[in-house]
């Protein structure tokens, strides 16, 4: 199921998409979309980013985090009760059915009569629980990538097994997107 | 090598149903996504339906969604097109194909044939 | 969805000589980041299944004969038999796998003359 995220009437809201880059600037395009990810691409369009730059986006609607380092959460400007409701962010991996997808829930509700004291951004990991985070070598070097639900530990070991391939191996390499396992 | 090996094929009434099977053998099914593509008579290749490695992830052509079902039993080395509400436009050979690394079809099934006539 | 588009539909070519294929898609199938054309070509011969024949644009499947190549980039590729023989006749098809619904031209017939 989606996982939620609320904002009040009036605020902005913020749903929370990542994804890592092979290398710095080695993007890939990345759709919005209001309604739960369709079989491909994103219905009802609200932004979308090529490998380079964001191409298309409507008003109220951006990116505020560095899409070239594959944040690529959207940020709702002044959200009204029309604004709640599921929406898509798909990451367009280039390959057959390579996209990830993340359907998220945004509720917005009418603000409260009393202001209450400014809380903490809703901790991430607890937001998403089965994003998975991979150590590389160096320090600080801790990497988010997007949900993938179809990858677990037997399959991460299969699919080691098929890399003595050599055509997948060199087409894993070159394909533009790593998951590094360490 | 790696062989792909069809049947469940014939003759349906249009609103009837067909399974059809793909038995594979030289490779481990589930570390690979696999497809079903068609090729009405006389027509060119029309993708189908794809299905992940694991089975979590179905994707359905829009001609197709709600009526087809593809699936697969790891354990048996197999995958399924389950077809339901069969049109006469379904009139096809049906391939199953095997997707290498997430790109392009390596492998092929000999095809069957469907006919949806009345 | 990416439409591709083959030209021409049939061609008849004298054995020896060389026969060329032209692919079109309705966007680039070009990823920049590792410099690949997402296209393969495909061939069918009467009552078989398709057989892979080229897969990112100009790399030849284990295999298949170098009269075969493959080129292009971006939205227009080629594929070429250098010298045709009589094997080679059958109807030959470009797919785009970059994104989407996996998409395959329409198909071009290539006899002898």
């Known amino acids: 199921s989606e996982v939620e995220y609320r904002a009040e009437v009036g605020q902005n809201a913020y749903l929370p998409c990542f994804y890592t880059p092979a290398a710095p600037g080695n993007l890939v395009p990345v759709c919005w979309g209001k309604g739960a990810c369709p079989v491909f691409e994103c219905g009802n369009v609200v932004l979308r980013t090529d490998e380079r730059d964001v191409n298309y986006w409507t008003s109220r609607y951006w990116l505020n985090g560095d899409f070239r380092k594959g944040d690529v959460s959207l940020t709702i400007e002044n959200v009204t009760l029309a604004d709640s409701g599921i929406y898509c962010c798909r990451i367009q991996i280039p390959g057959i059915m390579n996209d990830e997808k993340h359907n998220v829930k945004l509720v917005v509700i009418k603000p409260a009569k009393v202001t209450p004291a400014p809380t903490r951004q809703r901790d991430f990991t607890a937001a998403f629980p089965r994003m998975l985070t991979t150590r590389g070598h160096g320090p600080a070097e801790t990497q988010t990538l997007g949900s993938l639900p179809d990858i677990n530990l037997t399959q991460i070991s299969t699919l080691a097994n098929e890399l003595r391939d050599s055509r997948l191996a060199n087409d894993l390499r070159d394909s533009g997107a790593t998951i590094r396992i360490g | 090598q790696v062989q792909l090996q069809q049947s469940g094929g014939g003759l349906v009434q249009p609103g009837g149903s067909l399974r059809l099977s793909c038995a594979a053998s030289?490779?481990?099914?589930?570390?690979?996504?696999m497809s079903w593509v068609r090729q009405a008579p006389g027509k060119g290749l029309e993708w189908v339906s794809g299905?992940?490695?694991?089975?979590?992830?179905?994707y359905n052509a829009d001609s197709v969604k709600g009526r087809f079902t593809i699936s697969r039993d790891n354990s048996k080395n197999t995958l399924f097109l389950q077809m339901n509400s069969l049109r006469a436009e379904d009139t096809a050979v049906y391939y199953c194909?095997?997707?290498?690394?997430?790109?392009?079809?390596?492998?092929w099934g000999q095809g069957t044939l469907v006919t949806v006539s009345s | 969805e990416i439409v591709m588009t083959q030209s021409p539909d049939s061609l008849a070519v004298s054995l020896g000589e060389r026969a060329t294929i032209n692919c079109k898609s309705s966007?680039?199938?070009?990823?920049?980041?590792?410099?690949?054309?997402?296209l393969a070509w495909y061939q069918q011969k009467p009552g078989q299944p398709p057989k892979l024949l080229i897969y990112?644009?100009?790399t030849r499947e284990s295999g298949v004969p170098n009269r075969f190549s493959g080129s292009g980039s971006g939205t227009d590729f080629t594929l070429t038999i250098s010298s045709l023989q009589a094997e080679d006749v059958a109807v030959y098809y470009c797919?785009?796998?970059?994104?989407?619904?996996?998409?395959f031209g329409q198909g071009t017939k290539v006899e002898i003359k």
């Open positions: 797919q785009q796998y970059y994104s989407g619904p996996p998409t």
């Open positions: 299905i992940s490695g694991s089975g979590g992830s179905t």
């Open positions: 966007q680039s199938v070009l990823y920049s980041s590792n410099n690949k054309n997402y």
């Open positions: 194909a095997k997707i290498f690394g997430s790109y392009y079809f390596d492998y």
């Open positions: 030289g490779f481990t099914l589930s570390s690979y996504a």
């Open positions: 990112w644009t100009s």
